[in-house]
């Protein structure tokens, strides 16, 4: 049966035993800046092109044992959430992966900047259709990372990022705090903000909307046909990247402002229990859970 | 995220160092009164001192970025410091990534075309 997260983002008129839109997002390229990925996993084979871009710091600790499946875990899962064959949002979207996070899931602002620059140069060399950039990472507030995101957004690229898993104001983190970026918080099957250990999803006025981000079934790098459940604002951001890819595939001329407006318009309103957020943040945090549009044109969003 | 907000740095640290244009006899010294700023991550464990992104003013060309980077290396060498240019940015932001001692920040902030300098920091999978 359909996983809860795919059911949650699907408009009622499309609900069935299966998540039906089979080829959504086919005109869009989604760039993923994350860990390495298992590119031949059954969920994503042929859907993800691994670029030769790699800029990662060395792993911490002298006794760190580099295990391939662990190195690929985060990125493989997210690629599956965006475009996976069985459990993906935008099954028709093609992806390109850049490695900016090491085997411990750690990267640098500088490495991320060089990755964003790589995307811009690729766009200039070979202009394609609409581009979505997924940044499932967060660091402290960074003026330079926010500036780079702003420049890329002004070049017509849609950037989607994780709000962060620190149960804190997203405005204190980057790229979550960049105004031009679509910043995504995480909710669970009960439409509650996601708790992650002692922490949880970030919140506040720098968050644009929320999306499913707890117990998300997706590709596991443990084996080529394995699935695993993962949680976090990265998973939430991957849902929105998939939804954005489908919207842009249906309407390639959408501006960032129009896309943002559509994402907000089609979101479920006032379903999140705001009591989870600190009192001073409740009014600032958007009570929106992302969803696909109930297309007025048959198959508009599912071509 | 969330368009329409003013930039809020939170508890983000900012060090403003006034430029003394006469120092080092810079041929392309900035206009009087402009200041380049230094930024670093407010979360101490995430800081990566020793690597800095030098961001140049918006209209700076690649050749000027390269020249500024070389100038920094030359001036640092005269003071007995080794530096390494790790990457020259162009396409999104003009600037360069440099591995150097924090002792050279004051010198770097006085270079022509410099808008601000940010110490590198960590980002994490979410």
């Amino acid at each position: 049966s359909i996983p809860w997260n795919l059911e949650r983002i699907t408009p009622p008129r499309y609900r069935a035993d299966e998540y039906q839109p089979p080829d959504g997002g086919s005109l869009v390229e989604v760039y993923l800046l994350d860990t390495s990925i298992q590119s031949d996993h059954r969920e994503i084979e042929g859907r993800v092109m691994v670029t030769d871009f790699e800029n990662v710091p060395e792993e911490d600790g002298t006794r760190f044992h580099r295990q391939a499946s662990k190195c690929d875990s985060h990125g493989t899962h997210l690629a599956g959430v965006v475009s996976g064959r069985d459990a993906g949002v935008a099954k028709g979207a093609s992806m390109r992966s850049l490695r900016v996070l090491n085997c411990q899931g750690k990267g640098t602002v500088s490495g991320t900047l060089i990755g964003l620059e790589f995307i811009r140069k690729s766009q200039l060399v070979q202009p394609v259709g609409p581009l979505v950039v997924l940044l499932p990472l967060a660091g402290g507030y960074s003026r330079v990372l926010n500036a780079a995101c702003q420049r890329l957004a002004r070049a017509g690229v849609v950037l989607v990022t994780a709000a962060g898993n620190f149960r804190d104001d997203a405005c204190l983190y980057s790229p979550a705090s960049a105004p031009e970026v679509i910043t995504v918080g995480a909710t669970n099957a009960q439409d509650q903000p996601v708790t992650l250990g002692t922490l949880g999803t970030n919140f506040g006025r720098c968050v644009d909307l929320f999306a499913p981000g707890e117990d998300i079934i997706g590709a596991s790098s443990d084996c080529s046909t394995c699935f695993v459940s993962q949680s976090g604002t990265s998973q939430a951001a991957a849902h929105v990247a998939g939804i954005a890819a489908m919207m842009l595939s249906a309407e390639p001329e959408l501006t960032l402002a129009e896309l943002r407006q559509r994402l907000i318009h089609f979101s479920a309103k006032d379903v999140i229990n705001e009591a989870w957020f600190p009192e001073d943040q409740r009014v600032l945090t958007p009570n929106l859970v992302a969803a696909l549009p109930p297309s007025t044109h048959e198959n508009l969003y599912f071509q | 995220g969330a368009m329409g907000q003013e930039d809020e740095d939170g508890d983000y640290e900012e060090l403003v160092l006034a430029l003394r244009s006469e120092e080092d006899g810079l041929a392309e010294a900035p206009e009087h009164g402009t200041t380049a700023t230094f930024h670093r991550c407010a979360k101490d464990p995430w800081r990566l001192p020793g690597t800095y992104v030098v961001v140049l003013k918006e209209e700076t060309h690649l050749s000027q970025s390269e020249r500024t980077a070389r100038r920094l290396q030359a001036q640092a060498a005269r003071r007995g410091y080794l530096t390494k240019i790790l990457h020259v940015f162009h396409g999104l932001l003009p600037g360069f990534l440099v591995k150097m001692s924090g002792d050279l920040l004051e010198l770097a902030l006085k270079l022509p075309h410099v808008d601000y300098i940010e110490e590198d920091s960590s980002v994490f999978a979410q």
Epitope: E18, S39, D40, E45, C226, F227 | -
Partner: antibody, heavy 115, light 116 residues
Framework: QVQLVQSGAEVKKPGASVKVSCKAS????????ISWVRQAPGQGLEWMGW????????NYAQKVQGRVTMTTDTSTSTAYMELRSLRSDDTAVYYC????????WGQGTLVTVSS | QPVLTQPLFASASLGASVTLTCTLS???????VDWYQQRPGKGPRFVMR????????SKGEGIPDRFSVLGSGLNRYLTIKNIQEEDESDYHC?????????????FGGGTKLTVL
């Protein structure tokens, strides 16, 4: 264009081993694993297993588990399938196919097991 | 795991249409099925993938527009319109099942299509 080119026909005695190669071209080798499928004379298709070109992980069909070894050489974009302890009912045409999608196939390698 | 059942033989006149059927065993109505064409003495060729919503993804390379698919309940159909002599082939269907160590690929027995 995408091509999978397999090694030539083999005649083997029962108990021997055979190693079939499959050289891929026209796509990024590590973006798709390699599936192996065989077809006995006049019969349908039988899946034998799959190998990851990315990390070498394998997934074998129960029927051949223990007798089959699949390997890859990414430097030459070549996949290999070795079948040991051959029996007469292993006589078949052996095919490699691209990934789980199996959207491109090799021309086949006839392996005859006969005493 | 699912069992895929195909009729052994089918025939159609030149220029006519024919629909080949692949039936999944009970309980597997949501499964995707791949269709393959195998001309005499040649290797299989991917035609297209089908589920209850119709085609999944795109057709195999060089597959003409005369080939189309449909899915309904446990049945997966491959229809060939305006049949040509080169369509005379064996047609196999296949499906993936399970995950991890339980993953298998199953194939139907194949249908031999004769062009009259």
């Amino acid at each position: 264009q995408v091509q999978l080119v397999q090694s030539g026909a083999e005649v083997k005695k029962p108990g021997a081993s055979v190693k079939v190669s499959c050289k891929a071209s026209g796509y990024t080798f590590t973006s798709y694993g390699i599936s192996w499928v065989r077809q006995a004379p006049g019969q349908g298709l039988e899946w034998m297993g799959w190998i990851s070109t990315y990390n070498g992980n394998t997934n074998y069909a129960q029927k051949v588990q223990g007798r089959v070894t699949m390997t890859t050489d990414t430097s030459t974009s070549t996949a290999y399938m070795e079948l040991r302890s051959l029996r007469s009912d292993d006589t078949a045409v052996y095919y490699c196919a691209r990934g789980y999608t199996r959207d491109y196939w090799g021309q086949g390698t006839l392996v005859t097991v006969s005493s | 795991q699912p069992v895929l059942t195909q009729p052994l033989f089918a025939s159609a006149s030149l220029g006519a249409s024919v629909t080949l059927t692949c039936t999944l065993s009970s309980g597997y109505s949501s499964y995707e099925v791949d269709w393959y064409q195998q001309r005499p003495g040649k290797g299989p060729r991917f035609v297209m993938r089908v589920d209850t919503g119709g085609i999944v993804g795109s057709k195999g390379e060089g597959i003409p527009d005369r080939f189309s698919v449909l899915g309904s309940g446990l049945n997966r159909y491959l229809t060939i319109k305006n049949i040509q002599e080169e369509d005379e082939s064996d047609y196999h269907c296949g499906a993936d099942h399970g995950s991890g160590t339980n993953f298998v690929v199953v194939f139907g027995g194949g249908t031999k299509l004769t062009v009259l």
